[in-house]
C-alpha cells in the first residue's frame, strides 16, 4: 500500500476519505487505527456501528469520528479541531473477525494556522460544544508518497 | 440464473498434478467471493480457502496453505483449484461455492457448484 | 481457529417430528452462521444464513435461531425429502469452519 498524505490546518477539521471496492468488503466493519512506529501495532481509534447495516450513522471517539458509505465504497473519518499531536501515519480497516485488511495507509500532516496571532475579525471558528455536522470541515490536500519518499525530508 | 459450473471428474497418479476449473454466470464474476470445500468419501464439509475474483485477494485454511493454489481469472469468470503434486488422500469431491451478499450483509455460501469428483490412485 | 461442535452427529426421527440440531462456536461469531442441507451424491444447499434468515424458495418448516456461541437448527414438522445431513458453517473469521454434520435418518 502507497501511504496517502492528507494536510489539515491546526485548530480546523480535516476529512480523510479511505475509497474501497463495496461488493468485496460487503458486510465488514471498518475503523481507523493510528500506527505506532514503523513496525508497531496500530491502535484502534474508532470503528463503525456494530451493526453494519447502520454503519452510515456516524460514531466518534473524542475529536475523532467515522461514517461508512457502504453502497459507494467510501469511509469517511473526520479530525475536529486538528492539532498537532495528531499528525502521524494511520491506517483506514475494514475488519472480518480478528483480521484487519488496510484499505488505505495515511499520514495526517497538520499545518501552522496562517491567521495566527492575526486579528481574525469576523472568522467563525467551531466552538468546543458544537457538534461534528455543524463543524466546519477544510477541504484537505492529499497525495500520495512516491516509494522510498521520506515523508518529512530534513530542511536544510 | 445463477450458476456455478465445474470441470468433470478426474482420475490422476500420485505425483501428478492438476487443476480443475469452476465457472460462474449469471451474475457479475468479479464482485463475489469463490470458496472451495472439499469433501473427503465418507466424510464431511471442509472449508479450503476463499478468492476475490476482481484483485485475485485469496485467503487459505491453514489445513490446505501450501497444499493447492486457489486462483481466478475474471476474464473468462472462472476460479481454479491447482494442485502440483497429488496424493491418494487428496481423493474427493472438491465443491465450489460463492459467497452470497444480503441486505444485511454477507449470507454465506448461496450458490454451489455441482462438484467435482478427484480420485488419485496409482 | 474457530472450532464448530455440532450436536447431535446423527439422529433418527419420524416424518412430521420436530427436530432441533445445535452448532457451539468456540468464540464469538456474531450472528455470521449458515445451516447447510446436503443430500447423498449432491452438493449442499443454503437453507438459513445470519444465524435466523431464510433464503427465498427455502419452506418456512426450517428455521435458525441462536446468537453468541449456541445456534440452533429447527424443523418443525420432518417431511420425507428433509432426511439428509445438515451442517453449519461459521464465516465471521478465516478460516472458516464447518461443524462436523448431523445426519437424519429415518426411524
Known amino acids: 500500500h502507497n501511504t496517502t498524505v492528507f494536510q489539515g490546518v491546526e485548530g480546523q477539521s480535516l476529512q480523510v476519505s479511505c475509497p474501497y471496492d463495496s461488493m468485496k468488503h460487503w458486510g465488514r466493519r471498518k475503523a481507523w487505527c493510528r500506527q505506532l512506529g514503523e513496525k508497531g501495532p496500530c491502535q484502534r481509534v474508532v470503528s463503525t456501528h456494530n451493526l453494519w447495516l447502520l454503519s452510515f450513522l456516524r460514531r466518534r471517539n473524542g475529536s475523532t469520528a467515522i461514517t461508512d458509505d457502504t453502497l459507494g465504497g467510501t469511509l469517511t473519518i473526520t479530525l475536529r479541531n486538528l492539532q498537532p499531536h495528531d499528525a502521524g501515519f494511520y491506517q483506514c480497516q475494514s475488519l472480518h473477525g480478528s483480521e484487519a485488511d488496510t484499505l488505505r495507509k495515511v499520514l495526517v500532516e497538520v499545518l501552522a494556522d496562517p491567521l495566527d496571532h492575526r486579528d481574525a475579525g469576523d472568522l467563525w471558528v467551531p466552538g468546543e460544544s458544537e457538534s461534528f455536522e455543524d463543524a466546519h470541515v477544510e477541504h484537505s490536500i492529499s497525495r500520495s508518497l512516491l516509494e522510498g519518499e521520506i515523508p518529512f525530508p530534513p530542511t536544510s | 440464473e445463477v450458476q456455478l459450473v465445474q470441470s468433470g471428474a478426474e482420475v490422476k497418479k500420485p505425483g501428478e498434478s492438476l487443476k480443475i476449473s469452476c465457472k460462474g454466470s449469471?451474475?457479475?464474476?468479479?464482485?463475489?467471493?469463490i470458496a472451495w470445500v472439499r469433501q473427503m468419501p465418507g466424510k464431511g464439509l471442509e472449508w479450503m480457502g476463499i478468492i476475490y475474483p476482481g484483485d485475485s485477494d485469496t485467503r487459505y485454511s491453514p489445513s490446505f496453505q501450501g497444499q493447492v493454489t486457489i486462483s481466478a481469472d475474471k476474464s473468462i469468470s472462472t476460479a481454479f483449484l491447482k494442485w502440483s503434486s497429488l496424493k491418494a488422500s487428496d481423493t474427493a469431491m472438491y465443491f465450489c461455492?460463492?459467497?452470497?451478499?444480503?441486505?444485511?450483509?454477507?449470507?454465506?455460501?448461496?450458490?454451489w457448484g455441482q462438484g467435482t469428483t478427484v480420485t488419485v490412485s496409482s | 481457529d474457530i472450532q464448530m461442535t455440532q450436536s447431535p452427529s446423527s439422529l433418527s426421527a419420524s416424518v412430521g417430528d420436530r427436530v432441533t440440531i445445535t452448532c457451539r462456536a468456540s468464540q464469538g461469531i456474531r450472528n455470521d452462521l449458515g445451516w447447510y442441507q446436503q443430500k447423498p451424491g449432491n452438493a449442499p444447499k443454503r437453507l438459513i444464513y445470519a444465524a435466523s434468515s431464510l433464503p427465498s424458495g427455502v419452506p418456512s418448516r426450517f428455521s435458525g435461531s441462536g446468537s453468541g456461541p449456541e445456534f440452533t437448527l429447527t424443523i418443525s414438522s420432518l417431511q420425507p425429502e428433509d432426511f439428509a445431513t445438515y451442517y453449519c458453517l461459521q464465516h465471521n473469521s478465516y478460516p472458516w469452519t464447518f461443524g462436523q454434520g448431523t445426519k437424519v435418518e429415518i426411524t
Open positions: 461455492a460463492r459467497q452470497g451478499i444480503e441486505v444485511t450483509g454477507t449470507g454465506g455460501l448461496d450458490v
Open positions: 449469471g451474475y457479475s464474476f468479479p464482485s463475489y467471493w
